[in-house]
Each structure stands twice: as structure tokens, then as C-alpha cells.
């Protein structure tokens, strides 16, 4: 049904849903703080430049007693219950926060005439790419396949002078809600990744993965897996691995790698992270202090989703018009706006761009360094290290199949 | 009115140290982003660093190592720690506002003058 | 980061108009909307005369206009008067937190 808008007359309200079910089990009132220190932002920079009028969010809290896993397995209702709730007050403000499941967004795109936009930290899967008023500030899986694809494609570099055509990929079903998505983007076969390799296999159990290692039948030397390197560790242990084995770690929302004092483990020689490019302060702001590093990318979406709405509704009112018009909800996209970290480049669909970063495990020194980096605005990959200490023979990564190229 | 003051320039010798103070008035000055700017004698701008609103800092490359960049939000303060000066970093030093949008510095100070000689 | 590049000097007579471009790469100013402009008098700080490629702060005249094609913005002064003599840089977000100014332009009023 038609709800009104609380989105004008000076007056632009937010709304903020506060799932259960969340992409990371993170505390409510986490985010709470990081939308109020966004709010104070948003404020400041409005009456900065002359515009007197009133922001606020309204945080809309689900019962909890029906949803309560805590994961993003049964939020596909809780989003539609929260929205009936917003229904039924009759109280939806200029935009919606939230939700970071991608079964809720989806669901809620889906059963919704939106006429506002949507931001949502989080919202991974391929099923809410291309939505028209969905705007998502945590690299989605889409971005991911695109790197994987430029990379395997890649042969022009000192250190990688084979182009790689297949792949391995761990998927066990225990994953968080973002490694879920990502690997589920490159099982599904008709996903681009698919696509473009000529062999790929999914292994689920941990039996598999670890005969691929020293199988000499195997059929590629580079499997793909999504988490941290104890979850590596817990997998792989001390087992031996060929020396042209590749292990892709899709780390993205993890700085750890970039600390001073962190050395890499010996299992992790044969392994390349990939994760984002980290914030590169310690924010000691009120959202931030008592936050591990993947919990500090989910709360800052949250931060930077007002402060993009803040700069919409600052073009729209500078320009004179209208907040409550599909123009206005189809408006968070193909733009950079000023985050709290620094710049916050949208793709043409409202995904957010980033730079990721392939990091290797130096023999020398023990210590993660920065292979490459990739811009994914431009689909670009940038070489930093040319003559990488390597693990693998002549410091060059092997062919994805074996019996061909260094060994 | 909205005004960025700098200070704290002056004659240095290579290798030494200084540092620039920009006094924000007439802003929400934690709302915004903060820039140093430099103009070589005769030369173009050079954008030099910026500190966001959250507290996160960038550099030129010509820079980075050497210049620190801070804010003092509740003294509505802007500051730039320079060490290991080279006669190369000889400029007038402007501190910027960032509009909220990017690389679009709406206000400038007057600029303070470091000249880097032995 | 090389800088963009910019003619370093150019003229006009009074009432006349005159356009200074700004080229950079696929990486600057061709893969962002975000481009500016800035006029300097001499011995003053630079003044923001245009942002996001086309947009003009508030007392800024509307005599000038910014554009953008590819990798090549330009900053258009129509209706030339004496007191827009002046340097002129051009600047674009490239990506990351980095930004480049162009060389500067030098602009005489005949």
C-alpha cells in the first residue's frame, strides 16, 4: 500500500531497520551510534551551506521473537514484517537503511512498489545486482567475479605470465553471509565467472579439499576459498601441498593483513588474499572503538549510507527539487560522494567501487606484502611488486593446470 | 563569516622541521574534510594531503613520510607536521575546505609562506 | 600522479569568449564527473570556480561554464571582462583519495 512519506516541508526523515538477522552479528547499538555520528555529519554540512532543515532516522526495531537466529537465514520475512510494520504506522521516511541479507532485500524489492531508494550494507548476491533503487555499500559479489575474471585472464605481468582458464572453489555451507554469497556467485553456472573458465568445480567437503592438494590428477592448480586464514588453518593444517598449488583466500573485510606487527604463518605460503584496500586510520569516533575490523567496514556503510543520502538531499534541495519523486530514488548511483573515510565511488547500478588488493606471503620476510592491486571502477588491475619473493619456482605463479609451465 | 587562517611558516633549513596551524571559524568544522595545498614560487597548485571527517589521511607521494597531517576538531584546528624538509617543499602553504565534494575546495586561507634554505 | 595538462597561456578581447581545456587520462578525468576549476589573482588564494564538471558555486557568474568530453574537460569564460584576467587550474579526483591540478593557464584580457 501507498505510505506517506515523512520526507519534506524542511523535515527529511530516515529510516533505519534494525534486523535481527544481519549480514554480521553485530550489536544494534553499534549501529545506532554510527548512524547518529553520520546524522551529526549530515546536519553539519546542510546548515553549512545554508540549507535550515531537519534530519532525522528513525530506527525500526522487529519484535524478535519470530526472527531470531541472529543470521540471515530466516530474514526473507523480517524485512517484509518490518516493512508492514512501517506500513501500518504509516511512517516511511525519504530513504530505508537496511536491510543487509540478501534473501530480505531481495524479498523487499520484490513485494514493494519502491518509490524511495534503498541502501543496504550488505546484500551480496547476484540476485540484487541491477535494482534500480538499490544502493549497496559493501563490495557485492558481481565486483568480486569481475576482479577473478581480469586476473585469470592475465598474462602480461612478470610474476604471471600464463593466462588461467580453470578453477577449484570451496564452498562447505558453514560460510558468513558474505563468503556465502561470493562463492555461491562463482558456483552458479551461469554467473560470468562460469562463463569465462573452461573447468570449474566446487568441492564441499573437507576430505576433498585436502586430497586436492597433493592430487597429482587434479584438474587445476588455483582453488578459491572465502575467510581468514584460521579458517585456512582449520582446513589445511600442516598438510603438504604440491608446489604449484594456488590458493585464492577471499578475505575482503579484514585489515589485519596490513598491521605492523603481523607476521604470515607458514601455511599461508601458498596463498593469495584478496581483500580490500584498508582505511588507514584508527578511528577512535564513538561507532569505531570497539570494533573488530570487518564489524568497523559493516557500521561505516551504515555511517556512509546517511552521509549519502545527506549529499542527494543536498543536490536535490540546492537544485530545487523534489525528495519524494522516483527521480530522487534513482538518484544513488554513477556518483563519488565525500564518505567518512574518504571518497565512496557508485557504480551505474548504485554498487559501490573499491580497490581490492592481492597480498602474497613473502619467503624473505615472512610478511604479507601487496602483489597488486585492482581498481574495480575501471576493471583495471595495477601490479605494485614486480619481482615478488615468491614461494612458487622462478618467483612466477605456476599454470592453473598441471604439467605445463614452471612446476 | 566562514574563514580558514593559517600560521606557523617561516625560514627552515633542509632537513629540519615546522608546523602549520589552520584556524577554522564560521563551519561545522568536524563535518568537513581539510586540505593543505601548496604553490611553489612561480609554480601551480600541488594538492598536498587531506584529512577526512572520520580521521582518515592521504598524501601526495612527493610527501608521504615526511608531512603529517591532524585536526583538532573541538579546537576547530587544522595542522601540518612537516619534517625532513627539502628545498623543494619552498611554498605558500594553503589550508582548504572540501566542499563534500570532491577535489571542490570552496574556502581557502590566505596561505602562510615555508621557504626550506641553508 | 602526473598532473593534467593545460595550454599555459591564452587571451581574449573584452566581451569575447574564450575556452581553456584540461587534459588527463582514463584514469582521471575521464573516469570521474569530477572536475574543477579554480581562478587565482595574483598575490590572492585561488577562488572555486566550477565543481563536478559543470557546477557553479553560488555567486560565481553564470559567464562561466565547464564541460567535458572523454578525457578532456573545459572551462568556458564568455563575455570576457577585464577582471577575469587571472590563472586558471584545473583539477580532477583520480581516484582512491588523490587529486591532480593542471599546470595552471595564464588567461590576458587584451
Known amino acids: 500500500s501507498q505510505v506517506s512519506q515523512n520526507c519534506h516541508n524542511g523535515s527529511y526523515e530516515i529510516s533505519v531497520l534494525m534486523m535481527g538477522n544481519s549480514a554480521f552479528a553485530e550489536p544494534l547499538k553499534n549501529l545506532e551510534d554510527a548512524v547518529n555520528e553520520g546524522l551529526e555529519i549530515v546536519r553539519g554540512r546542510l546548515q553549512n551551506a545554508g540549507l535550515n532543515v531537519t534530519v532525522n532516522a528513525t530506527f525500526m526495531y522487529s519484535d524478535g521473537l519470530i526472527h531470531n537466529s541472529g543470521d540471515c537465514r530466516s530474514s526473507t520475512c523480517e524485512g517484509l514484517d518490518l516493512l508492514r510494520k512501517i506500513s501500518n504506522a504509516q511512517r516511511m521516511g525519504c530513504v530505508l537503511i537496511g536491510p543487509s541479507c540478501t534473501y530480505s532485500t531481495f524479498q523487499m524489492y520484490l513485494d514493494t512498489e519502491l518509490s524511495y531508494p534503498m541502501i543496504s550494507a550488505g546484500s551480496f548476491g547476484l540476485s540484487c545486482d541491477y535494482k534500480e533503487t538499490l544502493t549497496r555499500l559493501m563490495s557485492p559479489a558481481r565486483k568480486l567475479m569481475y576482479f577473478l575474471v581480469n586476473f585469470w585472464k592475465t598474462n602480461d605481468l612478470p610474476f604471471k605470465t600464463y593466462s588461467w582458464s580453470t578453477s577449484y572453489v570451496y564452498k562447505n555451507g558453514t560460510e558468513t553471509e558474505d563468503c556465502f554469497w561470493y562463492l555461491n556467485a562463482l558456483e552458479a553456472s551461469v554467473s560470468y565467472f562460469s562463463h569465462e573458465l573452461g573447468f570449474k568445480v566446487v568441492l564441499r567437503q573437507d576430505k576433498e579439499f585436502q586430497d586436492i592438494l597433493m592430487d597429482h590428477n587434479r584438474k587445476s592448480n588455483v582453488i578459491i576459498m572465502c575467510g581468514g586464514p584460521e579458517f585456512l588453518y582449520k582446513l589445511k593444517g600442516d598438510r603438504a601441498v604440491a608446489e604449484d598449488i594456488v590458493i585464492i583466500l577471499v578475505d575482503l573485510f579484514n585489515d589485519q593483513y596490513f598491521e605492523d606487527n603481523v607476521t604470515a604463518p607458514d601455511y599461508m605460503k601458498n596463498v593469495l588474499v584478496l581483500t580490500l584496500s584498508p582505511g588507514n586510520s584508527l578511528l577512535n569516533s564513538s561507532f569505531s572503538r570497539n570494533l573488530s575490523p570487518t564489524k568497523r567496514d559493516f557500521a561505516l556503510a551504515y555511517l556512509n549510507g546517511i552521509l549519502l543520502f545527506g549529499h542527494m538531499l543536498k543536490i536535490f534541495l540546492e537544485n530545487g527539487e523534489n525528495i519524494t519523486t522516483p527521480k530522487f530514488a534513482h538518484a544513488f548511483r554513477n556518483l563519488t560522494f565525500e564518505g567518512y573515510d574518504g571518497p565512496v565511488t557508485l557504480d551505474d547500478w548504485g554498487d559501490v567501487d573499491s580497490t581490492m588488493v592481492l597480498l602474497y606471503t613473502s619467503v624473505d620476510t615472512k610478511k604479507y606484502k601487496v602483489l597488486l592491486t585492482y581498481d574495480t571502477h575501471v576493471n583495471k588491475t595495477y601490479p605494485v611488486d614486480m619481482s615478488p619473493t615468491f614461494t612458487w619456482k622462478n618467483s612466477k605463479l605456476p599454470n592453473d593446470i598441471t604439467g605445463r609451465g614452471p612446476q | 563569516q566562514v574563514q580558514l587562517v593559517e600560521s606557523g611558516g617561516g625560514l627552515v633549513k633542509p632537513g629540519g622541521s615546522l608546523r602549520l596551524s589552520c584556524a577554522a571559524s564560521?563551519?561545522?568544522?568536524?563535518?568537513?574534510?581539510m586540505n593543505w595545498v601548496r604553490q611553489a614560487p612561480g609554480k601551480g597548485l600541488e594538492w598536498v594531503s587531506v584529512i577526512y571527517s572520520g580521521g582518515s589521511t592521504h598524501y601526495a607521494d612527493s610527501v608521504k613520510g615526511r608531512f603529517t597531517i591532524s585536526r583538532h576538531n573541538s579546537k576547530n584546528t587544522l595542522y601540518l607536521q612537516m619534517n625532513s624538509l627539502r628545498a623543494e617543499d619552498t611554498a605558500v602553504y594553503y589550508c582548504?575546505?572540501?566542499?563534500?565534494?570532491?577535489?571542490?575546495?570552496?574556502?581557502w586561507g590566505q596561505g602562510t609562506t615555508v621557504t626550506v634554505s641553508s | 600522479q602526473s598532473g593534467l595538462t593545460q595550454p599555459p597561456s591564452t587571451s581574449g578581447s573584452p566581451g569575447q569568449s574564450v575556452t581553456i581545456s584540461c587534459t588527463g587520462t582514463?584514469?582521471?578525468?575521464?573516469?570521474?564527473?569530477?572536475v574543477s576549476w579554480y581562478q587565482q589573482h595574483p598575490g590572492k588564494a585561488p577562488k572555486l570556480l566550477i565543481y563536478?564538471?559543470?557546477k557553479r558555486p553560488s555567486g560565481v557568474p553564470d559567464r562561466f561554464s565547464g564541460s567535458k568530453s572523454g578525457n578532456t574537460a573545459s572551462l568556458t569564460v564568455s563575455g570576457l571582462q577585464d577582471e577575469d584576467e587571472a590563472d586558471y587550474y584545473c583539477?580532477?579526483?583520480?581516484?582512491?583519495?588523490?587529486?591532480?591540478f593542471g599546470g595552471g593557464t595564464k588567461l590576458t584580457v587584451l
Open positions: 582548504a575546505r572540501g566542499a563534500g565534494t570532491l577535489n571542490a575546495f570552496d574556502i
Open positions: 564560521g563551519f561545522t568544522f568536524s563535518s568537513y574534510s
Open positions: 583539477s580532477s579526483f583520480a581516484g582512491g583519495s588523490t587529486l591532480v
Open positions: 582514463s584514469s582521471d578525468v575521464g573516469a570521474y564527473s569530477y
Open positions: 563536478a564538471v559543470t
